[in-house]
Interface confidence: low
């Protein structure tokens, strides 16, 4: 059996070498001479020759300094043979443990660590973690037991100890209130990692902490009072530019301004934010009326796109807006005036008065009236009073100028402001009908064939309106009834049928037809009748062709 005590060997030994480690023995040496040898890593396999054994005594020796961080354990096998070379023992595994020396200092995983923390962060807030490693033995020794400390903080404001580091984990946390990005946007910490729980070898690294922005600064008006002016009646006009400063990070929601008008219930103004410089642009949302209000005193508050992170006072500004008077056009009341008048209204008589009001109550202005459009030249107006009268006879049946019994005229009113302003009104004359038109036949020229003539329908037309129209009465006069007959074509008697009583010769005839409306207004019209050389329905007769060489040209 083997006798092998536990074997350990410190790394980095000074020597001299070879140096005895242990003596191994086989209790078979009582029976005869035993010779020892070793095999394995560090003996006969690389690194070869680190360990040797005295063949006869069994002394196991190390020949050079060991490095635990390269090889921490060596596994060898011991062999024992008799003088004739026969094995007297089975090979035995030998474990050689290299014990650690503190020959490695900690190494940070980065030279510079970067972290961030929100300004105003409370004590206890975790910021970042730094990490160091140590190649030494951290199981059996403190040679790799790293402790972290902060060596320095730059700047040392507002307190020289704004941060603390967990000795064991390397987690850096806030320890003091007062982180303020606007005062100190970055901190540079020199952190140390030392082994032997902080008492041994050490190394340093840098932790750069960026203090990130929160909305802890309000936008502040500077100045807080503004004046502007705007012409009346104009929307979307820039009145003034409001200036604010905000200490928070530019072009972030904590910096971007939102303006609110506190006393604009009518929604007459609007403030938009200039995205480039955060200015507030005050504009009119709708036209203002100088005559209603000449000055507005607006109170404008400014906040940010995101809410304040802490309790902050909202900055306000006062804007005085003067409304400028502008010469406004006179306004016809009503803008469209309807007047009913009979079409036989007397020439030169006043129909109506159509006047305009002057909006500029603060300017004493004179209004002058003119007729702008009067297509039939029927009207005239008093330039001072706006009284409108007829200059010619009205005619409801003048269908070129009258539509649906309505005659439209445009009137203008001009003030004497500077510049001159003109307003327009529309006058609608609703012309009531007078029975000033007798019925007329349509058509007045009629064609019949000589042979088998077809009766012809004649419509009766009256330009007036009921009751000055149908039912009509028709009568042939001046002996026309000798050759022709008429009869009514419909119950309203708005058309008649004309036909000859006998065969007529080809030629032209005149027939006198008396037509009378429902109010007995009558009129005799001459119908021109042509009898043509044809049969049935005549259409339109062709003129008789000249005869040449005694021959009739075929039709």
């Amino acid at each position: 059996d083997w006798v092998i005590p536990p074997i350990s060997c410190p790394e980095n030994e000074k020597g001299p070498f070879p140096k005895n480690l242990v003596q191994i023995k086989s209790n078979k040496d009582k029976e005869g001479k035993v010779f020892y040898s070793i095999t394995g890593q560090g003996a006969d396999t690389p690194p070869v020759g680190v360990f040797i054994i005295e063949r006869e005594t069994g002394w196991l020796k190390v020949t050079e300094p060991l490095d635990r961080e390269r090889i921490a354990t060596y596994t060898l096998f011991s062999h024992a043979v008799s003088s004739n070379g026969n094995a007297v023992e089975d090979p035995m595994e030998i474990l050689i443990t290299v014990t650690d020396q503190n020959d490695n200092k900690p190494e940070f995983t980065q030279e510079v660590f970067k972290g961030s923390v929100m300004e105003g962060a409370l004590p206890g807030t975790s910021v970042m973690e730094v990490t160091a490693t140590d190649a030494d033995d951290d199981v059996n020794t403190y040679n790799a037991a790293i402790a972290y400390t902060i060596l320095s903080q730059d700047p040392e404001l507002p307190d020289k100890n704004m941060f603390t580091i967990n000795r064991n984990t390397g987690v850096i946390s806030v320890v003091t209130t007062g982180l303020d990005r606007e005062s100190f946007p970055t901190y540079t910490l020199v952190v140390q990692a030392a082994d032997l729980q902080g008492e041994g070898l050490s190394t340093t690294a840098t932790a750069v902490i960026t203090v990130t922005d929160t909305n802890d600064n309000p936008p502040i008006f500077n100045p807080t009072t503004y004046k502007g002016q705007v012409p009346e009646n104009e929307a979307n006009v820039v009145i003034t530019t409001l200036k604010v400063t905000d200490a928070d990070a530019p072009n972030t929601p904590a910096w971007e301004a939102v303006y609110t008008i506190l006393n604009d219930d009518g929604g007459q103004f609007v403030v938009t934010t200039n995205p480039v410089n955060n200015d507030g642009i005050l504009k009119t949302a709708k036209g203002l009326d100088f005559e209603a209000k000449q000055q507005y005193i607006l109170h404008v508050a400014v906040t940010n796109v995101v809410p304040f992170e802490v309790s902050l006072t909202t900055s306000t500004a006062t804007v005085t807006v003067d409304v400028l008077d502008v010469n406004e056009a006179p306004i016809f009341v009503p803008p469209e005036k309807r007047v009913e008048v009979s079409e036989d209204f007397g020439v030169g008589q006043e129909i109506t008065s159509y006047t305009a009001q002057e909006p500029d109550t603060f300017m004493e202005q004179k209004i002058t009236y003119r007729i702008w459009r009067d297509t039939a030249n029927w009207l005239e107006i008093n330039p001072d009073t706006g009284a409108i009268s007829t200059r010619a006879e009205l005619d409801r049946e003048d269908f070129e100028h009258v539509k649906n019994s309505t005659y439209t005229a445009l009137i203008i009113a001009t003030d004497n402001g500077s510049p001159v302003a003109t307003g327009t009104g529309t006058l609608l004359l609703i012309l009531s009908d007078v029975n000033d038109n007798a019925p007329i036949p349509e058509p007045r020229t009629i064609f019949f064939c000589e042979r088998n003539p077809k009766p012809q329908v004649i419509n009766i037309i009256d330009a007036d309106l009921p009751p000055n129209t149908s039912p009509f009465t028709a009568e042939l006069t001046h002996g026309a009834s000798a050759n022709w007959t008429i009869q009514y074509n419909d119950p309203t008697q708005e058309s008649i049928i004309l036909k000859p009583k006998m065969a007529l010769e080809v030629g032209d005839y005149k027939i006198n037809l008396k037509l009378m409306d429902n109010q007995n207004k009558d009129q005799v019209t001459t119908l021109e009748v042509s009898v043509c050389d044809c049969e049935g329905a005549a259409g339109v007769c062709r003129k008789a062709q000249p005869v040449e060489a005694g021959l009739q040209i075929p039709a």
């Epitope: 409370l122 004590p123 307190d159 100890n161 320890v175 003091t176 802490v310 309790s311």
Partner: antibody
Framework: QVQLQQSGNELVRPGSAVKISCKAS????????MNWVKQRPGQGLEWIGQ????????NYNGKFKGKATLTADKSSSSAYMHLSSLTSEDSAVYFC???????????WGQGTSVTVSS | DIVMTQSPSSLAMSVGQKVTMSCKSS????????????LAWYQQKPGQSPKLLIY???TRGSGVPDRFIGSGSGTDFTLTISSVQTEDLADYFC?????????FGGGTKLEIK
């Protein structure tokens, strides 16, 4: 101005539970710790715990773990304390108080009296 | 937990007199990195909520009259009212805010003669 308005006084049976509310106004509710403090009649003050509405982080006095549960609702700017398994020992006035140099309490609610009686 | 002890438990003073009351902690309330003592004083008038008087041992709260003076460091602290007024009738509590759970002293009752 900062105000903390607590819910009304409660008379409850032993073994039951109660939920006290504290509505905050006049400051950024999410950015300050809300503390809860107990005061028995004629006695001193006992800190129950605190909650940070911004992220619902909370800290408790070990004595009140399991007894008090703190919650907060940012949308209504309200903090709540739920007290369970009530006994006569829980009869007290309970205050909510804003923490600023945490947990220094600069503004206090008017207090809610809880009486546990059968 | 840090234990806070106040003395005396009560005292009666006349208007205009100087009042001092003591508060001791079972461990130091001085934070070496900030050099601040994490101790506060509160005043509670009868039937009212407590009101913050002093924090960080000596910093007066908003709107607190300057007759209230906080002093001390480490484990021994004092609240002084330089010239007591009738409206100062109240209970006074000290509180450590050095570590959680924060703890209060038993209070000092100030009566006006």
């Amino acid at each position: 101005q900062v105000q903390l308005q607590q819910s009304g006084n409660e008379l409850v049976r032993p073994g039951s539970a109660v939920k006290i509310s504290c509505k905050a106004s006049g400051y950024a509710f999410s950015s300050y710790w809300m503390n809860w403090v107990k005061q028995r009649p004629g006695q001193g003050l006992e800190w129950i715990g605190q909650i940070y509405p911004g992220d619902d982080d909370s800290n408790y006095n070990g004595k009140f773990k399991g007894k008090a549960t703190l919650t907060a609702d940012k949308s209504s700017s309200s903090a709540y304390m739920h007290l369970s398994s009530l006994t006569s020992e829980d009869s007290a006035v309970y205050f909510c108080a804003r923490g600023f140099a945490t947990p220094t309490m600069d503004y206090w609610g008017q207090g809610t009296s809880v009486t546990v009686s059968s | 937990d840090i234990v806070m002890t106040q003395s005396p438990s009560s005292l009666a003073m006349s208007v205009g007199q100087k009042v001092t009351m003591s508060c001791k902690s079972s461990q130091s309330l001085l934070n070496s990195s900030t050099q601040k003592n994490y101790l506060a004083w509160y005043q509670q008038k009868p039937g009212q909520s407590p009101k913050l008087l002093i924090y960080f041992a000596s910093t007066r709260g908003s709107g607190v009259p300057d007759r209230f003076i906080g002093s001390g460091s480490g484990t021994d602290f004092t609240l002084t009212i330089s010239s007591v007024q009738t409206e100062d009738l109240a209970d006074y509590f000290c509180q450590q805010h050095y570590s959680i759970p924060c703890t209060f002293g038993g209070g000092t009752k100030l009566e006006i003669k």
